[in-house]
């Protein structure tokens, strides 16, 4: 069997290794009905064509049936995410059948061989489902396949091969290598179930992308842009581990999809919402916080079926751990004028004050240059529910775009020590909450004093619901 190694560094080498020769025919796929949350409980093995185990194991024909499909393995033993997912499904759906698809013999191989085995595993699952369909009361519509990494594509094959249509497939960071750009019949795709939802947490546009970048479902959700997950940076990993490695970072980000799904099962009262957007940069600018025309959705188990949509890319920010929910805000700041700005690019900071809580000081991420005499849009998110927003404190500081500009700025300052202060003029801030869809306008506390120098504070109070000005038509509030 393969020796263990880090998924990123050596997976690249794996793709070019010669095919291992199988010396013995090994059993391939087992179906383990998890009858208990306990990890040490052995569960019950279902056997195709044998009805007795169904009765002995207490398989409920009318209930929902979840098939959990693991991915490539370096250890030949189930990782703890699987135990957490089984436990969460049992907690949320007490009567459901939870089946772990054990394809370890075919997954504990060179990555390329495991990929080549996905089709046969998918076929085995389809045959099991076809056999179950022969039983009274069993409905394919009640079947939910949940596949992690390589397992997501196995689920796709199963959905493709089964007679009829599976109710739902959830792809948890479907594997990228050897699937990126593949034909729809050779990877997970929207045709594989009535509803296919996907979480992408480890995608990279440079280097090796462990997770698939392209959208492959009806809805494809990219938490934190689908790449760098909070709490998974090398610093976080090194901080929490005696011997942190890049392997741990990869595992953390790739596996985050599973934990987001588990979170959606166990923290039903704290659902995370994702918003449709054409790309990550537009989302970072705060442009995409609309819930009109099904443009927003819960993520994970609570996602609403949107069969009409195909390859709808959705984005959200998350916390570093459970519960992952954050509260998104779009902020529109109209910068009326710059004064003595030179080459300096401003960085804004806001503190939000609400009826429930106040936020920390939050930097406004600049995706593009700040435009003067124009409305600039930003995305802000808080980890706590602030309630209704009451006021906003704004500050800014100059951040040079380059060392050259910094040198120019310093030289300018040294030659003109009495250079008049740099100022921005901001009269109001428009805010939209992603979660409530409420729009609010905040006006400067002192309408006569709307200029702000670096390091100084400007306070804004809520002055109206909605965004419309007095001379415009009456304000409208969008509902989710």
């Amino acid at each position: 069997s393969p020796t263990p190694f880090g998924p990123e560094g050596q997976l690249a080498d794996e793709l070019h290794k010669p095919k291992a020769i199988q010396t013995e025919v090994k059993p391939s796929v087992r179906f383990n009905l998890r009858t208990s949350k306990d990890p040490e409980h052995e569960g019950c093995y279902l056997s195709l064509g044998h009805s007795q185990p169904l009765e002995d194991c207490g398989f409920n024909m009318t209930a929902k049936t979840f098939f959990i499909i693991h991915g490539w393995t370096m250890s030949g033993i189930f990782e703890n995410w699987l135990h957490k997912l089984v436990s969460a499904l049992h907690t949320r759906e007490k009567d459901a059948n939870v089946v772990v698809v054990d394809w370890l013999p075919l997954a504990h191989q060179l990555y390329t061989d495991a990929v080549n085995n996905t089709r046969v595993v998918g076929h085995s699952i389809a045959r099991m489902l076809d056999w179950l369909q022969e039983k009274d009361d069993f409905s394919l519509g009640n079947v939910h396949l949940i596949g992690y990494s390589l397992g997501a594509h196995v689920a796709g094959y199963a959905g493709n091969f089964v007679k009829g249509t599976v109710g739902r497939i959830t792809g948890l960071d479907p594997a990228g290598p050897m699937f990126e750009g593949a034909d729809i019949h050779k990877r997970l795709s929207p045709d594989d179930a009535d509803f296919v939802d996907v979480l992408h947490t480890y995608t990279r546009s440079f280097g090796l992308s462990i997770g698939i970048q392209m959208p492959v479902g009806h809805i494809d959700i990219y938490p934190n842009g689908g790449d760098f997950q909070p709490g998974c940076g090398l610093n976080d990993v090194l901080g929490s581990m005696a011997y942190g490695t890049i392997t741990e970072v990869v595992k953390c980000e790739h596996e985050r999809a599973v934990h987001l799904f588990v979170d959606s099962l166990v923290n039903q009262d704290k659902p995370s919402f994702a918003f449709q957007c054409t790309d990550s940069n537009r989302f970072k600018k705060g442009i995409c916080l609309s819930c009109r025309k099904n443009r927003c959705n819960s993520i994970g188990y609570n996602a609403k079926k949107m069969r009409n949509k195909r390859n709808s890319k959705m984005y959200l920010k998350t916390r570093a751990g459970m519960p992952f929910r954050v509260y998104h805000y779009q902020m529109k700041i109209h910068v009326f004028s710059y004064k003595n700005m030179g080459e300096i690019e401003p960085t804004f900071y806001v503190t939000l004050y609400g009826t429930n809580a106040d936020s920390q000081t939050l930097p406004l991420e600049i995706v593009e240059r700040i435009e003067q005499n124009a409305t600039n849009t930003f995305l802000v998110y808080t980890e706590e529910d602030l309630g209704d927003l009451l006021k906003i404190q704004l500050t800014w500081e100059g951040a040079s775009q380059s060392w050259y500009n910094l040198w120019k700025e310093l030289r300018s300052y040294l030659s003109q020590p009495h250079n008049p202060g740099r100022e921005l003029n901001i009269r109001r801030i428009r805010v939209k909450s992603g979660e409530t869809q409420r729009k609010l306008t905040f006006c400067a506390e002192d309408p006569e004093n709307t200029s702000i120098s670096p390091g100084r504070e400007l306070w804004f109070r809520k002055c109206r619901d909605g965004w419309r000005m007095k001379n415009e038509t009456s304000p409208t509030v969008e509902l989710p």
Epitope: P39, E40, I77, F78, N80, P105, H108
Partner: antibody, heavy 120, light 107 residues
């Protein structure tokens, strides 16, 4: 009743190899994994590696990668661990233990241990 | 590898006492902590899994608790057969690792 019966004590010379056995009974052999643990004299326990009897897949602790080879014979429900190029450092008690299918499953049943002495 | 530290290597107590044995992990192990008892004849038994779940047949005077990196095993009302060595083990990450053991002896 679940039982893991290990082979008897061994006294071997440096450079030799030894194969320790662990016969399982009282449960379905392929439904759990078999793990091997080393306890040097008066010391703690060290995980050597495991084998999944269902298909023979193994995973070793990097430290024992070149020392231990794990195999199973499904027909007799027996797991084996071969230790090669023995040195005095390999003198220890070796245990086999049963474990469920998850990382987190505990070692719920243990063999009685096999004492290995390596001496010239 | 995750280091498991049992700071107390030896502990003396009397029959009927209540004792607590601690175990610390070098990183968060998500409650995947198991406790084992080793008798002087070398026999090893599972006591507690997943921090606090009592294994079948283990007396209720044994209990486990903890979270994150700090865990403990408590034996209330010590009986003669409880004098043994106790090991903790993490099941969070490969390779699985054990604490160095705490030897509980009669005072």
């Amino acid at each position: 009743e679940v039982q893991l019966q290990q082979s008897g004590p061994e006294l071997l010379k440096p450079g030799a190899s030894v194969k320790i056995s662990c016969k399982a009974s009282g449960y379905t052999f392929t439904d759990n994994t078999i793990h091997w643990v080393k306890q040097s004299h008066g010391k703690s326990l060290e995980w050597i590696g495991h084998i999944n009897p269902y298909y023979g897949g193994t995973n070793n602790n990097e430290k024992f990668k070149d020392k231990a080879t794990l195999t199973v014979d499904k027909s007799s429900s027996t797991a084996y661990m071969e230790l090669r190029s023995l040195t005095s450092e390999d003198s220890a008690i070796y245990y086999c233990a049963r474990k469920g299918i998850y990382y987190s499953s505990p070692f719920d049943y243990w063999g009685q241990g096999t004492t290995l002495t390596v001496s010239s | 590898d995750i280091q498991m530290t049992q700071t107390t290597s030896s502990l003396s107590a009397s029959l009927g006492d209540r004792v607590t044995i601690s175990c610390r992990a070098s990183q968060d192990i998500n409650n995947y902590l198991n406790w084992y008892q080793q008798k002087p004849d070398g026999t090893v038994k599972l006591l507690i899994s997943y921090t606090s779940k009592l294994h079948s047949g283990v007396p209720s005077r044994f209990s486990g608790s903890g979270s994150g990196t700090d865990y403990s095993l408590t034996i209330s009302n010590l009986e003669r057969e409880d004098f043994a060595t106790y090991f903790c083990q993490q099941g969070n990450t490969l390779p699985f690792t054990f604490g160095s053991g705490t030897n509980l002896e009669i005072k």
